[in-house]
Interface confidence: medium
Amino acid sequence: QGWQAFKNDATEIIPELGEYPEPPPELENNKTMNRAENGGRPPHHPFETKDVSEYSCRELHFTRYVTDGPCRSAKPVTELVCSGQCGPARLLPNAIGRGKWWRPSGPDFRCIPDRYRAQRVQLLCPGGEAPRARKVRLVASCKCKRLTRFHNQSELKDFGTEAARPQKGRKPRPRARSAKANQAELENAY
């Protein structure tokens, strides 16, 4: 189609949108008891083999055009792809603390988007149609975040920060749980 690129490849962070962190994804459907993981200790335990410095989360820059149907952005946008291994799968204590250990199905830490930025682009359309403005959400930074299985907040933990800080002004919500659900969860923990 021979779209022409913008002359100025400057990226502008939109003041009204600014930066916003990744919304916490639901990582596990199985959540057990209301207890802080690791007893509030930092996540690097003696049984971990890797040092914090060995955790590698790479930010790979790539350039792409924003498209919407037949229309394409006049200039390409640059964003990041999060890549890299954030450490080995760790052994964690099981749900009822009998001293047995289990290995989660994936690594505890994942290299995922941490911050996003918004950028205005103008989409040029074929056939002399008027350009359309769009705001696109682009990955701005990546971070190793810890996946936690047994805690009362379904969020990704920032690497190197304290685990499961209590939330201010929020009461824990009691949930009715069936014996079957509890049993299944405990079996999953082995």
């Epitope: 100025n8 490849d9 400057a10 006049a74 008027a130 403005a133």
Partner: nanobody, 119 residues
Framework: EVQLVESGGGLVQSGGSLRLSCAAS????????MGWFRQAPGKEREFVAT????????GYADSVQGRFTISKDNAKNTVYLQMMNLQPGDTGVYYC????????????WGRGTQVTVSS
């Protein structure tokens, strides 16, 4: 509201040049993009060039790329269209348009200025 007034049109020989101006007044601080469009007799209005009012990034239609240059002077609230190597196919009424922040299309238009390229 933004008011747009175009000027600089005229009659020119094929291969010649013209510089169009678009003076904006009113709520120009709310402007996101400014653009130039043209309409040839019996044809639909078509996009020519666009410029980001804040950053100055420019985009062009394929038919004018390399021949036309869009620029702006924020201090004068004016957008320019420098047209080089004009061809008879460039004949038409040239309109300046403004797209406001938050809008997805051009909402304000000038009355246009006539450009005629003779062979």
């Amino acid at each position: 509201e933004v008011q747009l007034v175009e000027s600089g049109g005229g009659l020119v020989q094929s291969g010649g040049s013209l510089r169009l101006s678009c003076a904006a007044s009113g709520r120009t601080f709310s402007t996101d993009f400014m653009g130039w469009f043209r309409q040839a007799p019996g044809k639909e209005r078509e996009f020519v060039a666009t410029i980001d009012w804040r950053s100055g990034s420019a985009g062009y239609a394929d038919s004018v790329q390399g021949r036309f240059t869009i620029s702006k002077d924020n201090a004068k609230n004016t957008v320019y269209l420098q047209m080089m190597n004009l061809q008879p196919g460039d004949t038409g009424v040239y309109y300046c348009a403004a797209q406001m922040i938050g809008a997805s299309s051009y909402g304000y238009w000038g009355r246009g200025t006539q450009v005629t390229v003779s062979s």
